[in-house]
């Protein structure tokens, strides 16, 4: 890992609306160099959102997570609290990114090229989405009708930064929230580790109630195929763009000193995602949200440009 980078590596242009603290596992302040202060929230499904530190719900959430972390530390867990440089603890798998969000995660490995848009099957495999219900797109097998989407709040558009597979690279997520006792999920993990290829539908899974305060995700778990296929009928409410197809291991092949400018570009402007009918109302996006957010996520591409820093070549030698 290379330290001492003070450059802003996550730029937040839009802030998320409220997220229950029950669903948050970590928070992190962005760097002072970013200018606009923001809190980066990580959800239980390892999705990152920008939040406004001045909002009361954000203050309450941070306070709650701090208390949780303190309780965990008292119970023998280890906990690292650092405010400052944001280092995603894993490489970002593609998530719903706003065009105006610039993400510059640190990465490891040698440089390699990346196709802008993999096939949808590849994307599903990379993101862990289920083929029946790709994120952000209504699947015909989704027979479930939800409660009516919030009329008052279509949810923020494109506020999710990216989704973080729990075990992937050597980056450490420095956070003010509970860490798991024992071998840490957030600690250095093998860069080469790939997600399990076993079909999740054939696995029987068990979750037993652990000792008090052990509310973080189970250690060593991989989140593939859960948060990535949310309710088709809701999936556009908060992040109107679904995850953008990209290889999850894309960042692993770049030099240790590489930075990545990530930008989302529409591949084609045709088509908008279909939605299941909702019995007692219809989805209404917030008036102030830009229309681009309703474009088909399958038609978005990711342009990822490795930008090696000055010392990268020397370090590689």
């Amino acid at each position: 890992q290379h330290h001492g980078v003070t450059k802003c590596n996550i730029t937040c242009s839009k802030m998320t609306s409220k997220i229950p603290v029950a669903l948050l596992i970590h928070y992190q302040q962005n760097q002072a160099s970013c200018g606009k202060r923001a809190i980066i929230l990580e959800t239980r499904q390892h999705r990152l959102f920008c939040a406004d530190p001045k909002e009361q719900w954000v203050k309450d959430a941070m306070q709650h997570l701090d208390r949780q972390a303190a309780a965990l530390t008292r119970n023998g867990g280890t906990f690292e609290k650092q405010i400052g440089e944001v280092k995603p603890r894993t490489t970002p798998a593609a998530g719903g990114m706003d065009e105006s969000v610039v993400l510059e995660p640190e990465a490891t490995g040698e440089s390699s090229s990346l196709e802008p848009t993999p096939s949808s099957q590849e994307a599903q495999r990379a993101l862990g989405t289920s083929p029946e219900l790709p994120t952000g797109v209504t699947g015909s097998s989704g027979t479930r009708l939800p409660p009516t989407p919030k009329a008052q709040d279509g949810g923020p558009v494109g506020t999710e930064l990216f989704r973080v597979p729990p075990v992937s690279t050597a980056a450490t997520w420095q956070s003010s929230a509970p860490h798991q006792p024992g071998p840490s999920l957030w600690a250095e993990a093998k860069t080469s580790e790939a997600p399990s290829t076993q079909d999740p539908s054939t696995q029987a899974s068990t979750a037993s109630s652990p000792a008090p305060e052990e509310n973080a995700p189970s250690e060593g778990q991989r989140v593939w195929g859960q948060g990535q296929s949310p309710r088709p009928e809701n999936s556009l409410e908060r992040e109107e763009m679904g995850p953008v197809p990209a290889h999850t291991d894309a960042f692993q092949d770049w030099g240790p000193g590489s930075m990545a400018h990530v930008s989302v570009v529409p591949v084609s402007s045709e088509g908008t995602p279909s939605r299941e009918p909702v019995a007692s109302g219809s989805w209404t996006p917030k008036a102030e949200e830009p229309i681009h957010a309703t474009m088909d996520p399958q038609r978005l591409g990711v342009l990822i440009t490795p930008v090696p820093d000055a010392q990268a070549a020397t370090r590689r030698q």
């Epitope: 229950p20 499904q45 859960q226 949310p230 309710r231």
Partner: antibody, heavy 122, light 107 residues
Framework: EVQLVQSGAEVKKPGATVKISCKAS????????IHWVQQAPGKGLEWMGW????????RFNERFKGRVTITADKSTNTAYMELSSLRSEDTAVYYC???????????????WGQGTTLTVSS | DIQMTQSPSSLSASVGDRVTITCRAS??????LAWYQQKPGKAPKLLLY???ALAEGVPSRFSGSGTGTDYTLTISSLQPEDFATYYC?????????FGGGTKLEIK
């Protein structure tokens, strides 16, 4: 049509263990969170814990920690709740319920099983 | 833990009446509140959730209001099928907690 169908009534002795099942249909099982809620006779509702079938992340109410285990068999779209070291105050109706996995919305319970009555008596 | 205090615990009213049930949280829950209706021997049914959104299939005579720690469920004109027990639930933080319930009976 979304349905959560729970196993039948159980009568157990104190100290025993019970395992209640909740079979889901009408949606993709791993796409929704499963919760278990207890309702003692003439009493209100008490949340026991959640389980995300897609990523094995449980969270439990302190009151039930150490005694409750939540499992899922994805091949049969069935969730299970096991409660051990039973005592008479565990006599209640137990419900499974689902919540949205667009987790940013939060866990309100939009679909419920019909409930399973557990009687703990010596 | 956030405690939810519901009042009144029971209430008698007639068809056509306007009824109000209140729920007070022991801490801020940022509008992450749901209301449920439960009839004897049945599972609860979702009525309203975050920011007072009406659940699918719920009649518009049900409405919610409130912010911070104090919330209200209003039934504008009681119908015979509305006599039941009503619960509020906060889902801002775990453990998720429910109010003690309000039993709505026919006068």
């Amino acid at each position: 049509e979304v349905q959560l169908v729970q196993s039948g009534a159980e009568v157990k002795k104190p100290g025993a263990t019970v395992k209640i099942s909740c079979k889901a249909s009408g949606y993709t099982f791993t796409n929704y969170n499963i919760h278990w809620v207890q309702q003692a006779p003439g009493k209100g509702l008490e949340w026991m814990g959640w389980y995300l079938p897609g990523d094995d992340s449980p969270r439990f109410n302190e009151r039930f920690k150490g005694r409750v285990t939540i499992t899922a068999d994805k091949s049969t779209n069935t969730a299970y709740m096991e409660l051990s070291s039973l005592r008479s105050e565990d006599t209640a109706v137990y419900y499974c319920a689902t919540s949205p996995t667009d987790e940013t919305q939060g866990d309100y319970f939009d679909y419920w099983g019909q409930g399973t009555t557990l009687t703990v008596s010596s | 833990d956030i405690q939810m205090t519901q009042s009144p615990s029971s209430l008698s009213a007639s068809v056509g009446d306007r009824v109000t049930i209140t729920c007070r949280a022991s801490g801020r829950i940022h509008d992450f509140l749901a209301w449920y209706q439960q009839k004897p021997g049945k599972a609860p049914k979702l009525l309203l959730y975050t920011d007072n959104a009406l659940a699918e299939g719920v009649p518009s005579r049900f409405s919610g209001s409130g912010t911070g720690t104090d919330y209200t469920l209003t039934i504008s004109s009681l119908q015979p099928e509305d006599f039941a027990t009503y619960y509020c639930q906060q889902f801002w933080s775990t453990p998720y907690t429910f109010g003690g319930g309000t039993k709505l009976e026919i006068k």
